[in-house]
């Protein structure tokens, strides 16, 4: 290891995983347990992130890099670097202040996280509903009614009594 790279600042020679120890003539001391430095020339080491409680360790802290956390089963990460864990809900639900609630009629959520979103309005694109929406699934839009003239397609149009997007609850 080259210790003479910088005559001006001996600390610039200290690599990641060390800190420049002023108490010991600016030698490159190891980052002590549960701390790290990810860049060279550091005068202190950073304390490792603790993945506790609802967080679990995805990657342990090393001398040169911080720990990385994810969430325990039943929770998912939010924020940069998984700074928060949010409770999972079932598909067809969204998380509210009062806990997991079913999606309102006309909305769906096909994931365990996030909010319920409105079903696609097929008619805006001049299409018809091929498969009805549910709490867990969006509607499937099919060809426009005009494309469904007799003999033009083998697709059976939806029952006329149903409104677009309706789903039996």
């Amino acid at each position: 290891f080259e210790r003479t790279r910088s005559l001006q600042d001996p600390c610039s020679n200290c690599p990641a995983g060390t800190f420049c120890d002023n108490n010991r003539n600016q030698i490159c001391s190891p980052c002590p347990p549960n701390s790290f430095s990810s860049a060279g020339g550091q005068r202190t080491c950073d304390i490792c992130r603790q993945c506790k409680g609802v967080f679990r360790t995805r990657k342990e802290c090393s001398s040169t890099s911080n720990a990385e956390c994810d969430c325990t089963p039943g929770f998912h990460c939010l924020g940069a670097g998984c700074s928060m864990c949010e409770q999972d809900c079932k598909q067809g639900q969204e998380l509210t202040k009062k806990g997991c609630k079913d999606c309102c009629f006309g909305t769906f959520n096909d994931q365990k996280r996030g909010i319920c979103r409105p079903w696609t309005n097929c008619s805006l694109d001049g299409k018809s509903v091929l498969v009805n929406g549910t709490k867990e699934r969006d509607v499937v839009c099919g060809p426009s009614p005009a494309d469904l003239s007799p003999g033009a397609s083998s697709v059976t149009p939806p029952a006329p009594a149903r409104e677009p997007g309706h789903s039996p609850q």
């Epitope: 690599p15 990641a16 995983g17 060390t18 347990p33 549960n34 342990e60």
Partner: antibody, heavy 117, light 112 residues
Framework: QVQLQQSGAELMKPGASVKISCKAT????????LEWIKQRPGHGLEWIGE????????NYNEKFKGKATFTANTSSNTAYMQLSSLTSEDSAVYYC??????????WGQGTLVTVSA | DVLMTQTPLSLPVSLGDQASISCRSS???????????LEWYLQKPGQSPKLLIY???NRFSGVPDRFSGSGSGTDFTLKISRVEAEDLGVYYC?????????FGGGTKLEIK
Amino acid sequence: QVQLQQSGAELMKPGASVKISCKATGYTFSSYWLEWIKQRPGHGLEWIGEILPGSGVSNYNEKFKGKATFTANTSSNTAYMQLSSLTSEDSAVYYCARLGLAWFAYWGQGTLVTVSA
Amino acid sequence: DVLMTQTPLSLPVSLGDQASISCRSSQNIVHGNGNTYLEWYLQKPGQSPKLLIYQVSNRFSGVPDRFSGSGSGTDFTLKISRVEAEDLGVYYCFQGSHVPRTFGGGTKLEIK
């Protein structure tokens, strides 16, 4: 899981040198300090020094400067400690250990070095 | 160098008893970063030492909760609430706050 596998026992003549190896598996070898410890019956445990394999930077207990030299090969995930100018005082079990939540979170099984004419 | 003095040298106990080992450092062992790197290790016959306690009072993973560490400054204690046969061996305290890092002389826990 973290494992440190050390080389086998050595019987050496006074004045000779010996090189002990410590092969690491189960973690990113280059990113953790490796420590070396000496144990002699009746003398307890002594810290020799340490090496950070990724950069090759090392620190030594003043008592072992000139006696021990640390190297590491990151392609084989193996650290080495060479002991020079052996005397009977160097007869001991030598351990490598990896830093973690503590200075010696994980230990090798030890290498017995015997110096005898 | 920081001298680590362990007492007693030998500790005869009956299984199920509480055991207490003292470790005193010749100077304060707070690191420059504010942490106290006082650790306890157990070495069973024919084995490598194993980490029990780190930073004075934290149990390492897999260490039974009958082991506890306490202390500050220069006085530290390891307690075993109910000694079991597998706890027998030599216990070492260690300070990693100052260079050179140093071990205590060891305390042998044995059956009375």
